[in-house]
């Protein structure tokens, strides 16, 4: 294929791939008709003047995962057709001025995972057609004003995983076509008002894992097209009342891992398209009425690992489309009988690791589609008659680690559990805590006559059509209907997958599917 170097493989489709530690310089001669060249995992340390001079038809050039630390300014001369250039995962500390001069067709420039200490306006001043610029994973401490002023067509800019401590309010002002801006994992403590005002087409803004303590009230007021806003793992202690007021297209908002103590009224709205709201790992202590009432399309609400001790009966007003509600690992002792009444489409609710002593009999009355209820590790001694009767789709019910009181009052629940054992899973079954003579025995197979020998057991109305079998052995083990795999953070749809962490630590999270939180 017009002379393929021995260290490389060349395909009919004009694709050349050169890999291996034996390679210490750009192989020659490269086929003149090459359109794609990949130089990966080599020991190349520098690019000299014009190594690609004879392959002017090149469209894509990937020089990744090498030892590259030095590039001559004219290294990419004569590559006027180049659209994609990646220098990611090398050891570049400095970019020579003029390096990208003449790359008039360049649309994607990947400089991520190097050791770049600074960028200057002159670096990108010739790249007027650039659509994507990846600078994440470097050592940038500041971005000078004007750095991106010539990149008016830029749609994606990633500055994540650097050491930025502040951002000038003017640095993004000319990026009117930008759709994705990622600033995650820096050291930003605040963002000046006006920083994002020019980004009228922004769809995704990633600010997670910084040290942001305060958000300016009008910070996002010009970003009417914003769909995904990631603010998790910062130091935000309060949200200005109007901060999210102009975000009608927002469908995902992550605020987990902050220091929020309260949710100010009207803070979320109107956001008619918001589907997911992640608020776990904050310091929220109570939920007032109507706090989410503008979120008519919300499907996932994660409030776990806060300090919630009080939920007002109208706290979930408006959440008619909610599917997943995570309230686990809070300080709940009581729930008003009306608190879930609006959640007609709820499928999964997690209430484990609270201090609930009892549940209202009608707590799930309007929530007929419930499929999974997590109630383990509370202070429940019994449950009201018929509490689950109408839940025909219920396939996962976790009741273990509660101090069940196995006297005659437990019979209706025990009988229902006998007939619905598969729903309890196989890992852990509920066991009696009292009286002392039956402590530790399975609630399902306990003989209540033994538990309270001195008391005549009256005829207790049981859950419908569930006869009492005093000595029935437990049913054969049945596989749990659904797993409790948990994501520690919502998958943030990154093509570069920089922040996705998946775990299956069920003991910590113990929730169902999308209830990550």
């Amino acid at each position: 294929y017009h002379g393929c170097p021995s260290e490389c493989t060349c395909s009919r489709a004009s694709q050349v791939e050169c890999t291996g530690a034996r390679i210490v310089a750009v192989p020659t001669p490269l086929p003149w008709n090459a359109m794609s060249l990949q130089i990966l995992n080599t020991h190349i340390t520098e690019l000299n003047e014009s190594p690609f001079l004879n392959i002017s038809a090149l469209i894509a050039l990937r020089i990744e995962k090498n030892e590259l630390s030095r590039i001559t300014p004219g290294a990419f001369r004569n590559l006027g057709s180049l659209r994609y250039l990646s220098l990611a995962n090398n050891k570049l500390q400095v970019l020579p001025i003029g390096l990208f001069q003449g790359l008039d067709s360049l649309e994607s420039l990947l400089l991520s995972s190097n050791q770049l200490l600074q960028i200057q306006p002159a670096h990108f001043s010739q790249c007027s057609n650039l659509k994507e610029l990846q600078l994440h994973g470097n050592h940038l401490e500041y971005i000078p004003d004007g750095a991106f002023d010539h990149l008016v067509g830029l749609t994606k800019l990633n500055l994540g995983k650097n050491s930025l401590t502040h951002i000038s309010p003017r640095v993004f002002q000319h990026l009117g076509n930008l759709q994705v801006l990622r600033l995650y994992e820096n050291r930003l403590t605040d963002i000046p008002m006006g920083t994002f005002d020019g980004l009228v087409n922004l769809q995704e803004l990633a600010l997670q894992q910084n040290q942001i303590g305060l958000l300016s009230p009008g910070l996002f007021h010009n970003n009417h097209n914003l769909q995904r806003l990631y603010l998790s793992n910062n130091h935000i202690s309060q949200l200005p009342p109007s901060v999210f007021m102009q975000l009608p297209q927002l469908n995902r908002l992550t605020l987990f891992g902050n220091s929020l103590k309260e949710l100010s009224p009207g803070i979320f709205g109107p956001m008619p398209n918001l589907r997911e709201l992640w608020l776990y790992d904050n310091h929220i202590s109570s939920l007032p009425d109507n706090v989410f009432s503008n979120l008519r399309q919300l499907q996932v609400l994660i409030l776990s690992r806060n300090q919630i001790s009080f939920i007002s009966p109208g706290a979930f007003n408006g959440l008619t489309e909610l599917r997943e509600l995570s309230l686990h690992t809070n300080a709940l002792q009581d729930l008003d009988g009306n608190v879930f009444r609006m959640l007609a489409n709820l499928q999964n609710i997690s209430l484990q690791n609270n201090r609930l002593r009892q549940l209202p009999g009608n707590i799930f009355a309007n929530v007929n589609g419930l499929m999974a209820i997590q109630l383990q590790n509370n202070q429940l001694e019994n449950l009201p008659l018929g509490i689950f009767d109408h839940l025909g789709k219920l396939c996962e019910l976790r009741l273990y680690d509660n101090p069940w009181r196995c006297d005659s009052d437990i019979l209706p629940l025990r009988n229902w559990l006998l007939l619905n054992q598969p729903r309890l899973g196989t890992d852990t079954v509920p066991v009696c805590f009292s009286p002392a003579n039956v402590r530790g025995q399975s609630l399902i197979i306990i003989n209540v006559n033994v538990a309270v020998p001195s008391v005549h057991v009256p005829e207790v109305p049981s859950y419908p059509e569930t006869p009492w079998y005093p000595d029935t052995p437990s049913y054969p083990d049945t596989t749990s209907v659904s797993s409790t795999t948990e994501l520690t953070s919502p998958v943030e749809d990154y093509t570069d997958l920089t922040t996705i962490q998946v775990t299956d630590d069920r003991s910590v999270w113990g929730m169902t599917q999308a209830q990550s939180g």
């Epitope: 009342p241 007032p288 009425d289 109507n290 009966p313 009306n338 002593r357 209202p360 009201p384």
Partner: antibody, heavy 118, light 107 residues
Framework: QVQLVQSGAEVKKPGASVKVSCKAS????????INWVRQAPGQGLEWMGW????????KYAQKFQGRVTMTRDTSTSTVYMELSSLRSEDTAVYYC???????????WGQGTLVTVSS | DIQMTQSPSSLSASVGDRVTITCKAS??????VAWYQQKPGKAPKLLIY???YRSSGVPSRFSGSGSGTDFTLTISSLQPEDFATYYC?????????FGGGTKVEIK
């Protein structure tokens, strides 16, 4: 239908205590918060606190902390509000009230007049 | 504590009049405001909740509006049975607080 029936009027001396009862019917007593609100003669309404009958948990307004105690008897579906160290400015009608679908007071007792006078 | 300032404290009106009562919260309470009607010797009666929703059985001449800090109760055409005292209440934050009341009297 939901009903809250309160005990009768009381006359107390300054420094004494008073215990007002509120008997609930028409719903599952243990499942809904019950509040106490008072109204001094010719004055406005003042929220005192709530009790959750299922657990006995309470929350009191800071103003009454240390002087008010709310309790319940689940066997009779009755909540009680006891106010101690009475002073003349505690003269008021005391209402029990239950929330509806939000933290507003949908159901009210008829009120109990407590007069504090030497 | 959140102060609820109600005005006017009293007003005189005739049957058929349009009456407007306002309530101003000292801080943002969202839409967590209720309005009550109280007649002498009786317990208050819920009229409006969540700032603008009529309680069941309440005539349509009663309406509420507002959000944040400014709220209004309107009686579009005053009827003889409407002469009473009206209270606003915020239930966004503890302690829940009431306005001072507005007494609507016959002119």
């Amino acid at each position: 239908q939901v009903q809250l029936v309160q005990s009768g009027a009381e006359v107390k001396k300054p420094g004494a205590s008073v215990k007002v009862s509120c008997k609930a019917s028409g719903y599952t007593f243990t499942d809904y918060y019950i509040n106490w609100v008072r109204q001094a003669p010719g004055q406005g309404l003042e929220w005192m606190g709530w009790i959750y009958p299922g657990s006995g948990n309470t929350k009191y307004a800071q103003k009454f902390q240390g002087r008010v105690t709310m309790t319940r008897d689940t066997s009779t579906s009755t909540v009680y509000m006891e106010l101690s160290s009475l002073r003349s400015e505690d003269t008021a009608v005391y209402y029990c009230a239950r929330w509806g679908y939000g933290a507003y007071f949908t159901y009210w007792g008829q009120g109990t007049l407590v007069t504090v006078s030497s | 504590d959140i102060q609820m300032t109600q005005s006017p404290s009293s007003l005189s009106a005739s049957v058929g009049d349009r009456v407007t009562i306002t309530c101003k919260a000292s801080q943002n309470v969202g839409i967590n405001v209720a309005w009550y009607q109280q007649k002498p010797g009786k317990a208050p009666k819920l009229l409006i909740y969540s700032a603008s929703y009529r309680s069941s059985g309440v005539p349509s001449r009663f309406s509420g509006s507002g959000s944040g800090t400014d709220f209004t109760l309107t009686i579009s055409s005053l009827q003889p049975e409407d002469f009473a005292t009206y209270y606003c209440q915020q239930y966004n934050a503890f302690p829940y607080t009431f306005g001072g009341g507005t007494k609507v009297e016959i002119k």
